[in-house]
Interface confidence: low
């Protein structure tokens, strides 16, 4: 007797109900009086649920299991497990006996999403460049154990001086605490990403630290060390500041913003007056804040072509300048998934799955995964084409040989925004019979 169960583990969220599928092929004339069905824990052989002598013998597993009585006669011996707990994780064996005897084991993988991380900083005031700070990232009540990644404002991994601990509570759910020790630069953004490896769920948080600057004798022009990230179509502020001396007046100020590479004039303030935008009429200063030393530039309706370095020149009696980078970004759309061929699929067939996501910037990173979050790297072709606005359309094609059934997920990542757009498709091939039919 052939007993069929899913090849892949069944993933269930803590607190939800799970169905452990199990089926057999009843012969003509089969009646439930002939059926003996036993579900038990594979390792300990503990009885979970049984059906014998034509009757459901009920749950032997904390009263949280049920069969599908109306479907048993059709060969559906599946088990419903209610209010799933971490302790339920493991292998369950489905034994079916009519005249012949057969059994198969199905794995239950339990999962719980992690909470959005909370971030704390120690010390959290009077910070100066060069100080060592401890940033703690805490995320709660997830399962299984998380993977924790730290990144800077550009999404570059921070691997040094990280200590991560994970503690399980009485329900078996994990609380994660990850500590990053870092020496401060002029300023910086630090992001913590807590990943659930089973759900492929990422929980992000970040903290931006702007230390105080040490005073110096000369005019010091200050800009952010890290690029300013701006979404296409939004407004961006390129921050620039100087320290006005007592008695400073705007009549003394010469302020010039220009493109660092080409030296093209962007905006200027001279002779006590705003000389206006020389950059497609999309720039403005903050006139009410200039006297306090705020020379920041507002760039409106950001385009991809704006990306690059802008230099802020300030001249009073002294002269100073500094360059700030503008990094333009646009989020990718939720991927659309297409399948070719898309019907009459059988295990062993080769299918082509196309994942398309539109109008993002900069170029995306594309990852394919199966239903358990295992990366699929073979036979993937990805193309990215920029449109007239410089935004990219991404098309990624995965060629795969079908198993009994399967879920295929495409993840399109914007490396600057650290934004992930997901799409997935579940393919259920018609079941094979063994031996194969002629």
């Amino acid at each position: 007797l052939e007993v069929q169960v899913p090849e892949d583990p069944v993933v269930a969220l803590v607190g939800t109900d799970a169905t452990l599928c199990c089926s057999f092929s009843p012969e003509p004339g089969f009646s439930l009086a002939q059926l003996n069905l036993i579900w038990q824990l594979t390792d300990t052989k503990q009885l979970v649920h049984s059906f014998a002598e034509g009757q459901d013998q009920g749950s032997a597993y904390a009263n949280r299991t049920a069969l599908f009585p109306d479907l048993l006669a059709q060969g559906n011996a599946s088990l419903r497990l209610q209010r799933v707990r971490v302790a339920d994780e493991g292998s369950f064996t489905c034994f079916v006996s009519i005249r012949d005897f057969g059994s198969a084991a199905v794995s239950l993988q339990v999962a719980a999403p992690y909470s959005k991380p909370s971030m704390t900083l120690e010390p959290n005031k009077d910070l100066r460049p060069g100080d060592t700070v401890t940033i703690t990232c805490s995320s709660y009540q997830g399962y299984p154990e998380a993977e924790v990644f730290w990144q800077d404002g550009q999404g570059v991994p921070l691997t040094g001086n990280v200590t991560t601990s994970q503690m399980a509570n009485e329900q078996g759910l994990f609380d994660v605490h990850s500590i990053l020790r870092v020496v401060l630069g002029a300023n910086g953004t630090y992001s913590c990403l807590v990943r659930n490896p089973v759900l492929q769920q990422d929980a992000h948080s970040s903290v931006t630290i702007t230390p105080q600057r040490s005073p110096t004798g000369a005019v010091e022009v200050q800009v952010p060390e890290d690029p300013v990230v701006a979404l296409v179509g939004t407004d961006a502020t390129l921050r620039c500041s100087f320290s006005p001396e007592p008695g400073f007046s705007l009549a003394q100020l010469n302020l010039i913003w220009q493109l660092t590479d080409t030296k093209q004039l962007v905006h200027s303030f001279t002779e006590g007056r705003d000389q206006g935008s020389a950059y497609a009429n999309r720039t403005a200063l903050f006139p009410d804040l200039l006297a306090q030393g705020n020379a920041s530039l507002r760039l409106q309706r950001v385009r991809v072509a704006d990306e690059g370095s802008f230099t802020c020149f300030v001249s009073i009696r002294d002269f100073g300048s500094a360059a700030v980078s503008l990094q333009v970004a646009a989020p990718y759309s939720k991927p659309s998934m297409t399948l070719e061929p898309n019907k009459d699929l059988r295990p062993g067939d080769t299918v082509t799955i196309t994942c398309s996501s539109y109008r993002g910037y900069p170029e995306a990173e594309v990852f394919w995964q199966d239903g358990q979050g295992v990366p699929l790297t073979g036979n993937v072709t990805t193309s990215q084409m920029a449109n007239e606005q410089g935004l990219f359309d991404v098309h990624s094609v995965l060629r795969v040989v079908l198993g009994a059934n399967g879920t295929y997920s495409c993840l399109v990542r914007n490396p600057v925004l650290q934004q992930d757009a997901h799409g997935s498709v579940t393919i259920t091939g018609q079941p094979m019979t063994f031996p194969p039919e002629a």
Epitope: T159, G160, N161, S325, P362, E363, P415
Partner: antibody
């Protein structure tokens, strides 16, 4: 396809200077940390210098004060300016993406000899 | 003399499992993630294992990495003749503020 292509190597006398270039393609260059690594003939790998995407720089003690790493994001190019060259700087120089070099170039050879 | 210590050579027969060690200190392996590189004769090195135990796409699952305390290991199971190469470990060093490579291990398949 992600590619890195080094150039600028050659024969130079002790005390001389040389500038290596590394042209990047197939990825968003400005978003990535970059590095230079060298390998003397018959020897192991030695990390030389690295530059963050925000242009902060790091150097091995053996080249500090003599070598300068820089980048031009508009040209998708990484540079290594090498001054006061010594015989022990003779090596194949590789550029790579990230400090941990997930992608390598094919290398360019620098020979310091009189 | 490298701060990260590797055995200069290792060997094994086809099908065997071979382990290459990399020993450091609390300033490097103790607090940072480890990367491994393979350099076949006459070619540029390639990243084999990153972030201590992750494989880039295209690297067979015969290669695995691990770390314990101030030491790291690269394991190769089901050894094949094409695995004959030099293997290097590397990590960041907090005291030197630079990236370090080990001295390298020449693996011979007998």
């Amino acid at each position: 396809e992600v590619q890195l292509l080094e150039s600028g190597g050659g024969l130079v006398q002790p005390g001389g200077s040389l500038r290596l270039s590394c042209a990047a393609s197939g990825f968003s260059f400005s978003n990535y940390d970059m590095s230079w690594v060298r390998q003397a003939p018959g020897k192991g790998l030695e990390w030389v210098a690295g530059i963050r995407s925000g242009s902060r720089t790091y150097y091995a003690d053996s080249v500090k004060g003599r070598f300068t790493i820089s980048r031009d994001n508009s040209k998708n190019t990484l540079y290594l300016q090498m001054n006061s060259l010594r015989a022990e700087d003779t090596a194949t120089y590789y550029c790579g993406r990230y400090f941990n070099m997930d992608v390598w170039g094919q290398g360019t050879t620098v020979t310091v000899s009189s | 003399q490298s701060v990260l210590t590797q055995p200069p050579s290792a060997s094994g027969t086809p099908g065997q499992r071979v382990t290459i060690s990399c020993s450091g200190s609390t300033f490097n392996i103790g607090t940072n993630l480890v990367h491994w590189y393979q350099q076949l004769p006459g070619t540029a090195p390639k990243l084999l294992i990153y972030l201590t135990d992750r494989r880039p796409s295209g690297v067979p699952d015969r290669f695995s990495g691990s770390k314990s305390g101030t030491s790291a290991s690269l394991a190769i199971s089901g050894l094949q003749s094409e695995d004959e190469a030099n293997y290097y470990c590397a990590t960041w060093d907090d005291s030197l503020n630079s990236f370090l490579f080990g001295g390298g291990t020449k693996l011979t398949v007998l």
